[in-house]
């Protein structure tokens, strides 16, 4: 959300989120760093142009046009510099003058070693229960930002895990359309569109970075689970990863695994949609799954196939009209998995990303819970490793990401919700290695054709 | 280059307290965390654990808790290590040595702190 | 925890003599293992990381090999300046843990 110099009366109030670096003479002698050359306080350039139709209420969701809600001034850093006060340096750079270029690897978290494994388990859980550094949250909206009395910024700390997890809800989230009114659910700022791909990306740098400056290791990567093994168990869901089956209760995960104590945050959907609260840093109930034991559905009680992946590939158009879950010939339609394998849109379909999700048959499962299970993360890193292929493949070809007319959110030059400093969706569409500091240790399935007799 | 200057022997009765400095230069002091290694006379090596230098979140390692705090001062490049309440037993060689260049091992290393606790 | 044993304890060689030194873990630190030596009065050093690169400024004569368990540091030719203590690290959960040391004397 903001970072914790700019939850305060005077920045809401003036609208400038510029924090000083290293102020020498006094608060606001070095915003941005500019007294380095890192960077300068300036407006906010946010996505203007119009949205599909499905989003009827303009002026009514502080996510529109963001972040001009909150703020209109914000730190533009210069060369490789990057971060909220310019203060640190863009991905795949780092150096005290973000001169020197850093590629780390993502790996299967089956290829790991023991100590490997390990070293991710524990450094998931200390995310967990470590309070953000740098960022906390809106627990009311704009309107309500600054509390009762107009002089309490309504924020709170939460921990580099639950900042994870709340950006993602606060994506996800209803409008809020007023008390004793339905609230609008026709909206997702990083699902159902072109910003399903570019959104997650960013939302897993974030975290990896988060982590990075924890452990104070800048080699630290995330893995990935490949979940196309076209099998009906969780391969990972074992206790020296990401934990086994309870035997007390088998939606539960078994008390031999750390994350049998990790308690949820946002589950109180209720309350948001019609009080208008926001989720806050409250936690809950404990994580919830069940792999492949949705009886009531068996299309999603087995993985998807590895040939699904490779025919993913295939799809060269990365997106098209109407941009939306309905979308037929879309890369990203079907790697978030509304289409078959093919590209061809199927209401009953539910495939690749959407149905590793609902295999979990739990917490993981609910898009405004998701990440509370940090299966999530995995699940991610293995949809990004299959985008950043097809970046590869096709060049990064984002011609057909619409620069306008896409669900709210969704617009090429759209600021991802709620991330801070903006990003647009175009910042992301670009290979990894080349551009964002990290690569991707795997091999894809070459596609089969079956030669007629 | 990295360098990494530590504060000079002391001699403490048992009960006492000691602080040892670390004072780093060469290199981007917040950057890195900063271990500290304990060597008894005569014997090896034991991690008594880190500080994270952006932060200032310590972890310890199984047996340095309670009488062990790791601080630092960023305006100094200088990371400390206080032991409380000495005991005859916390007589030892006492290192600093940042994550530089890997997280997995240390490559530059402070010249070492004696601390002699005796009645 | 992982523990990591070292032997000998103590090896007697004479100068211009191969030296072998042997480290092995409880269970398997893929190549996360480094090796340093340490003179009396003196900081230890670093000689090799991830089992088997050379750290900047060690001479040729100093290899190192293994992955999993079993690891070993070889001195190919033994020179005055090598007789010391040498350690085995690896890291758990960001602790370092250290073999308990093999001393290098002069026969």
């Known amino acids: 959300q903001f970072p914790r110099q700019c939850a305060t009366v005077e920045a809401l109030r003036s609208g400038m989120c510029c924090p000083d670096l290293s102020p020498v003479s006094g608060p606001g002698t070095d915003r941005c760093g500019s007294s380095s050359g890192r960077g300068r306080c300036e407006a906010v350039t946010a996505d203007s142009r119009p949205h599909s139709p499905q989003y009827p209420h303009d002026g009514r969701d502080d996510r529109e046009v963001w972040p001009l809600r909150f703020f209109n001034r914000t730190c533009h850093c210069n060369g490789n510099f990057s971060g909220h006060n310019c203060g640190t340096c863009r991905p795949g750079w780092r150096g005290a003058a973000c001169d020197q270029r850093v590629l780390i690897v993502r790996r299967n978290l089956l290829d790991l070693s023991k100590e490997e494994k390990n070293h991710f388990v524990r450094a998931l859980d200390m995310a967990k229960r470590t309070t953000h550094p740098l960022f906390v949250i809106a627990t009311r909206r704009s309107e309500e930002i600054l509390g009762p009395d107009g002089n309490t910024p309504q924020f709170e700390n939460i921990s580099i895990y639950n900042y994870f997890v709340w950006t993602h809800y606060y994506s996800v989230k209803k409008t809020f359309l007023g008390v004793g009114q339905e609230s609008f659910g026709e909206v997702d700022f990083s699902h159902e569109g072109p910003a399903f791909l570019t959104w997650h990306r960013y939302h897993l740098l974030r975290l990896e970075k988060d982590m990075q400056e924890m452990l104070q290791e800048p080699s630290f990567s995330l893995p990935y689970w490949n979940f196309a093994t076209g099998k009906n168990v969780c391969d990972i869901c074992t206790d020296d990863l990401m934990g086994s089956r309870s035997n007390f209760d088998s939606t539960l995960i078994s008390p031999n695994s750390v994350f049998s104590q990790w308690r949820v945050v946002c589950d109180s959907l209720e309350d948001y949609d019609t009080l208008g609260t926001l989720c806050n840093s409250t936690e809950d109930g404990p994580i919830r799954r069940n792999p492949a034991g949705n009886v009531a559905r068996p299309m999603v009680q087995r993985l998807p196939e590895p040939q699904d992946v490779a025919q993913c590939l295939e799809v060269g158009l990365f997106d098209t009209p109407p941009f939306y879950s309905n979308s037929t010939n879309s890369f990203r339609n079907t790697v978030e998995g509304y289409s078959d394998p093919t590209g061809k849109y199927d209401p009953a379909v539910r495939s690749l990303h959407n149905l590793a999700h609902l295999f979990l048959n739990g917490t993981g499962g609910q898009t405004h819970l998701s990440p509370n299970d940090p299966i999530f993360v995995l699940l991610h890193t293995f949809t990004d490793a299959v985008f950043d292929e097809w970046l590869r493949r096709y060049n990064a070809d984002i011609s057909t990401f619409p620069l306008e007319n896409a669900p709210i959110g969704h617009n090429r030059q759209y600021n991802m919700v709620p991330f801070w400093p903006p990003v647009t969706n175009t910042e992301m569409f670009v290979t990894a290695p080349d551009n964002l500091g990290y690569t991707y240790e795997i091999q894809w399935p070459s596609r089969e054709f079956s030669v007629p007799e | 280059q990295v360098q990494l200057v530590q504060s000079g022997s002391e001699l403490k009765k048992p009960g006492a307290s000691v602080k040892i400095s670390c004072k780093a230069s060469g290199y981007t002091f917040t950057s890195y965390a900063m271990n500290w290694v304990r060597q008894a006379p005569g014997q090896g090596l034991e991690c008594m654990g880190w500080i994270n230098t952006n932060t200032g979140n310590p972890t310890y390692a199984q047996g340095f808790t309670g009488r062990f705090v790791f601080s630092m001062d960023t305006s100094v490049s200088t990371a400390y290590l206080q032991i409380s309440s000495l005991k005859a037993e916390d007589t030892a060689i006492y290192y600093c040595?940042?994550?530089?260049?890997?997280?997995?091992?240390?490559?530059?290393w402070g010249q070492g702190t004696l601390v002699t606790v005796s009645s | 925890e992982i523990v990591l044993t070292q032997s000998p304890a103590t090896l007697s060689l004479s100068p211009g003599e191969r030296a072998t030194l042997s480290c092995r873990a409880s269970?398997?630190?893929?190549?996360?293992l480094a090796w340093y030596q340490q003179k009396p009065g003196q900081a230890p050093r670093l000689l090799i990381y991830d089992a088997s690169n050379r750290a900047t400024g060690i001479p040729a004569r100093f290899s190192g090999s293994g992955s999993g368990t079993d690891f070993t540091i070889t001195i190919s030719s033994l020179e005055p300046e090598d007789f010391a203590v040498y350690y085995c690290q690896q890291r758990s959960n960001w602790l370092y843990t250290f073999g308990q040391g093999t001393k290098l004397e002069i026969k």
């Open positions: 040595a940042p994550r530089y260049s890997s997280s997995w091992y240390l490559d530059y």
């Open positions: 269970q398997s630190v893929s190549s996360y």
